[in-house]
């Protein structure tokens, strides 16, 4: 038997993936555990093997179908269970009735590219990945730029309160190396959270022309 407190958190990427993390205070050692998803209205069900990510937490991804297929809607509820093997039986360690569109976390934006760069400004674009058509334009973005001698945590956040997949960074220093990241969040969902940050895009501003500031 496993004692201690348990936390079971899952997010839907809005298309065909539910990612889950299960934390358990108390020794599990070599126990095999999995997450089982059982939707209330659909014919499929899915299982993934929980793998350790730290001493007391495990994670797995429920792959519901092809990456861009729409497998759930706002009417669906999915019963999610953590099952751990005890001898020949499976024991339910945690359970939740999961409303996918109340618990959204999209994939990180992809395909970041510099559209145009000058001495003091840089125009950058990106794309969203595996995002449901249900959102239409109801998305927001946060972006940050890493300047030399600073950390990501120190970078000020730029907020785009609409579905705008580009940004024009201003007041940059000429001939300087920067890095840029962006993340996305749907406006829908009580427990919806920001996507992971995108892979950083490195760029360099153009040097100032001689004789000009």
């Amino acid at each position: 038997a496993v004692n201690g407190t348990s936390q079971f958190t899952c997010f839907y990427n809005s298309r065909a993936n539910i990612s889950c993390v299960w934390s358990q205070d108390g020794a599990l050692q070599d126990t095999s555990c999995q997450v089982h998803a059982w939707p209330d209205r659909r014919r499929w069900n899915q299982t993934c093997e929980l793998l350790p990510v730290s001493q007391a937490s495990w994670a797995c991804n429920l792959i519901l179908g092809a990456p861009d297929s729409q497998k759930l809607t706002t009417v669906d509820i999915v019963t999610l269970r953590v099952l751990c093997r005890e001898g020949v039986r499976w024991r339910v360690m945690a359970i939740q009735d999961f409303k996918p569109f109340e618990n959204l976390r999209l994939m990180a934006p992809i395909s970041l590219q510099v559209v145009h760069v000058e001495t003091h400004r840089c125009n950058i674009s990106w794309e969203i990945s595996q995002a449901s058509h249900y959102f239409e334009r109801h998305l927001e973005f946060e972006a940050r730029t890493l300047s030399p001698g600073h950390t990501w945590e120190e970078a000020p956040l730029l907020t785009l309160k609409q579905k705008q997949e580009w940004i024009c960074l201003e007041t940059l220093t000429p001939d300087t190396q920067y890095e840029f990241q962006v993340r996305v969040k749907p406006l829908q969902g009580e427990f919806t959270t920001w996507s992971p940050w995108s892979q950083p895009l490195a760029f360099r501003t153009k040097p100032a022309a001689l004789g000009k500031d």
Epitope: D40, R41, R42, V75, H133
Partner: antibody, heavy 116, light 107 residues
Framework: QVQLVQSGAEVKKPGASVKVSCKAS????????ITWVRQAPGQGLEWMGD????????NYNEKFQGRVTLTVDTSISTAYMELSRLRSDDTVVYYC?????????WGQGTLVTVSS | DIQMTQSPSSLSASVGDRVTITCRAS??????LNWYQQKPGKAPKLLIY???GLHSGVPSRFSGSGSGTDFTLTISSLQPEDFATYYC?????????FGQGTKLEIK
């Protein structure tokens, strides 16, 4: 095998209420939504609402303006659809169905006639 | 509400014919589209779920395709028992809605 058996035909007066039952067998009643659909003679299908027997959660078609109430009795694996303030255009066949990626099993239908 | 429009409303065909019925949704419903067959005096029967999934016991001459707003039910070779009325239905969002039906008659 999965079966949904509905109660028999009813004749009601305008303004009255009717309660149609739907007894399920052959599967775990609490694990699937039960939906209600109606059909006027020679007409198409119209969704009224659904209920999840495991929790009692319901969804209703706003068209019925609070006239419809869906309930279940899990002890006898039976779902109920009550329609109040009956009008002559409620003279239709009422169906219950199990929902599992589409309405995969249906009751035989219950004809309700509203006539003064 | 999502409107579902079927075409044609009625169709005459012969045994052995290949028949196609279309269904258009008023907004994107992804693949959350089901097809039913109904004969006079009987309850509807599920044929196809989630656009192309063949319900158990349904003959393989029935197939479905489409995505987004435009969907198709195809009967590859009509059999005498296929003459009936066919309905599409979306289960993308409440209230669930049906097409108005396509009556398939013997030519």
């Amino acid at each position: 095998q999965v079966q949904l058996v509905q109660s028999g035909a009813e004749v009601k007066k305008p303004g009255a209420s009717v309660k149609v039952s739907c007894k399920a067998s052959g599967y775990t009643f609490t694990s699937h939504w039960i939906t209600w659909v109606r059909q006027a003679p020679g007409q198409g299908l119209e969704w009224m609402g659904d209920i999840y027997p495991g929790s009692g959660n319901t969804n209703y078609n706003e068209k019925f303006q609070g006239r419809v109430t869906l309930t279940v009795d899990t002890s006898i694996s039976t779902a109920y659809m009550e329609l109040s303030r009956l009008r002559s255009d409620d003279t239709v066949v009422y169906y219950c169905a199990r929902e599992r990626g589409g309405f995969d099993y249906w009751g035989q239908g219950t004809l309700v006639t509203v006539s003064s | 509400d999502i409107q579902m429009t079927q075409s044609p409303s009625s169709l005459s065909a012969s045994v052995g014919d290949r028949v196609t019925i279309t269904c258009r949704a008023s907004q994107d419903i992804s693949n959350f589209l089901n097809w039913y067959q109904q004969k006079p005096g009987k309850a509807p029967k599920l044929l196809i779920y989630y656009t192309s999934g063949l319900h158990s016991g349904v003959p393989s001459r029935f197939s479905g395709s489409g995505s987004g707003t435009d969907f198709t039910l195809t009967i590859s070779s009509l059999q005498p028992e296929d003459f009936a009325t066919y309905y599409c239905q979306q289960d993308n969002n409440h209230p669930y809605t049906f097409g108005q039906g396509t009556k398939l008659e013997i030519k």
